[in-house]
């Protein structure tokens, strides 16, 4: 008499996350009389997937009618796959006794879940970053099967190079994930730039997954003063102005010294924006002169957010100012300098 | 060789259904997406939507939501475009068109055309 | 949706001659551009993809540039069997757009 053959005519079944998945087995012979069982994988640690006799599989079902007279089709259909549900599946014949004998097996069929990425999740630095520094930008997506993907970072229209990117784990896996990292070299102008991390794998097929990142998050543009007298006026006053331009983000506080002490703090808000997204911001003082019997000292101290505070200061000369003052001067553009005006 | 083999002319009358057939050969049909694109006469391209071909999924172009439906009978690797109701501004060649791999998204394969006249 | 813009709807030109075609998008698709040229009664057929990226086949006289939101398809020097309508068409965004189309005719 011809052997008994367990026919899996199927080496790999590949199966998107979701659908349904049928492992197909057959029979060569009805003798030796026993029955069907489904596992996955082998040895001693297999896993029961379905036994006709005996047992509870609500996901699976079989292909035929199992009761059938002279059945010799013992597919089975499993339903809803996730990427849990990988591995080799084997249809294995018994010999019916007391225990039943495993008697032979087929060839096993592998089972592999197509599953989609998650969507990128892109995060910046914790702390912000000045023109000229490097940043670096993280992007993750998880649960995706096959382990063969393709990511790519963008920022204003070009492609960045500057990226690191892992894919876990490196061995067999039901599912796998992504972790990217971008470097990206910041500029004066990218208050209004995002970096984009795109990721695309086969069961995306028409449309990739994109995750943004703002680097108005990342960057600090500090800010640059400078210090002007306007003409003296009829009354002896002097208005002096303090512009604050281009910085980001809007948390600022000014603060006025005369001759050292604080004469005027201001809190920057509701500011309009520039083109680039920076802000700019002017403070007035107006200082009588006639008050004062000698120099008097002024500072425009400047606390961009939370950063060391910047000051310019100049002097106005009191002893030998005339009554109409027709000069524009401005401060010297360097951190403490002072400026004398006549 | 890559082959998007599409059906013959239709003649409609307005009302009625129509049914279009791209079937592919050369490549793993459930690996790439099928594209469909409308060319009025004299006009340019439109482009009506996606299929996904391993999960089934639809996108469709705003103006081609409602009446318009992308089939697929992967064991025959072939994809369907079905307009139902046509009217006579349906009138126009459709294209299939197959999705491009990895981050190259553009349709690299293109159907020769099925010319679909609505008419009374 | 994004919008592609072809300047010109049609060009008269001379064999010989050297053709450029300009695309512009309405935001920036990051180098996701492809040119197609179409002859009357034919499907499209893909020239370049990626901006700059010939396919395989295409006649190295033709070239595709640009970057952000501006493109350019050029035509060395022009055979008769160029003459064609052709198309740029963004595929960084759904919906995919088409440009109205260049048609390229002989003087």
């Known amino acids: 008499e011809e052997e008994l053959q367990v026919i899996q005519p199927e080496k790999s079944v590949s199966v998107a996350a979701g659908d349904s998945a049928t492992l197909n087995c057959t029979v060569s012979s009805l003798i030796p009389v026993g029955p069907i069982q489904w596992f996955r994988g082998a040895g001693p640690g297999r896993e029961l997937i379905y036994n006709l006799k005996e047992g509870h599989f609500p996901r699976v079902t079989p292909v035929s009618d199992p009761t059938k007279r002279n059945n010799m089709d013992f597919s089975i259909r499993i339903s809803n796959i996730t990427p849990a549900d990988a591995g080799t599946y084997y249809c294995v014949k018994f010999r019916k006794g007391s225990p039943d004998v495993e008697l032979k097996s087929g060839a096993g069929t592998e089972l592999s879940v197509r599953a989609k990425p998650s969507a990128p999740v892109v995060s910046g630095p914790a702390v912000r970053a000045t023109a000229e520094h490097t940043v670096s930008f993280t992007c993750e997506s998880h649960g995706f099967s096959p382990r063969d993907i393709t990511l790519k970072w963008f920022k204003n229209g070009n492609e960045l190079s500057d990226v690191q990117t892992n894919v876990d784990p490196a061995g067999k896996s039901v599912s796998y994930s992504i972790r990217s990292t971008a470097r990206v070299v910041l500029t004066r102008r990218d208050v209004h730039s995002q970096v984009i991390c795109e990721v695309a794998h086969v069961t995306l097929q028409g449309d990739p997954l994109r995750g943004t990142a703002n680097l108005s998050e990342a960057i600090r543009v500090p800010p640059f003063l400078e210090v002007t007298q306007q003409s003296m006026r009829a009354d002896n006053q002097v208005n002096v102005t303090c512009q604050v331009t281009k910085f980001y983000p809007q948390r600022l506080q000014l603060t006025w010294l005369e001759n050292g002490n604080v004469s005027r703090t201001e809190m920057a808000s509701a500011l309009p924006e520039n083109k680039d997204g920076t802000y700019n911001w002017t403070s007035w003082l107006l200082v009588n002169v006639s008050a004062h019997r000698d120099d008097v000292k002024l500072t425009c101290q400047v606390e961009h957010d939370g950063q060391p505070a910047v000051n310019k200061s100049f002097s106005v000369k009191v002893s030998a100012h005339p009554k109409e003052q027709g000069s524009n001067t401005a401060a010297e553009n360097t951190g403490t300098n002072e400026r004398n005006i006549y | 060789q890559i082959q998007l083999v599409q059906s013959g002319p239709e003649l409609k009358k307005p009302g009625e259904t129509v049914k279009i057939s791209c079937k592919a050969s050369g490549y793993t049909f459930t690996d790439y997406a099928m594209h469909w694109v409308k060319q009025a006469p004299g006009k340019g391209l439109k482009w009506m939507g996606w299929k996904n071909t391993e999960t089934g999924e639809s996108t469709y172009a705003e103006d081609f939501k409602g009446r318009f439906a992308f089939f697929l009978e992967t064991s025959a690797s072939t994809a369907y475009l079905q307009i139902n109701n046509v009217k006579n501004e349906d009138t126009a060649t459709y294209f299939c068109?197959?999705?491009?791999?990895?981050?190259?998204?553009?349709?690299?394969?293109w159907g020769q055309g099925t010319s679909v006249i609505v008419s009374s | 949706d994004i919008q592609m813009t072809q300047s010109s709807s049609s060009f008269s030109v001379s064999l010989g001659d050297r053709v450029t075609i300009t695309c512009k998008a309405s935001e920036d698709i990051y180098n996701r551009l492809a040119w197609y040229q179409q002859k009357p009664g034919n499907a499209p057929r893909l020239l370049i993809s990626g901006a700059t990226s010939l396919e395989t086949g295409v006649p190295s006289r033709f070239s595709g540039s640009g970057s952000g939101k501006d493109y350019t398809l050029s035509i060395t020097s022009l055979q008769t069997e160029d003459v064609a309508t052709y198309y740029c068409q963004q595929y960084w965004n759904s919906p995919r757009t088409f440009g109205g189309g260049t048609k390229l005719e002989i003087k």
């Open positions: 068109a197959r999705g491009g791999y990895g981050s190259n998204y553009v349709m690299d394969y």
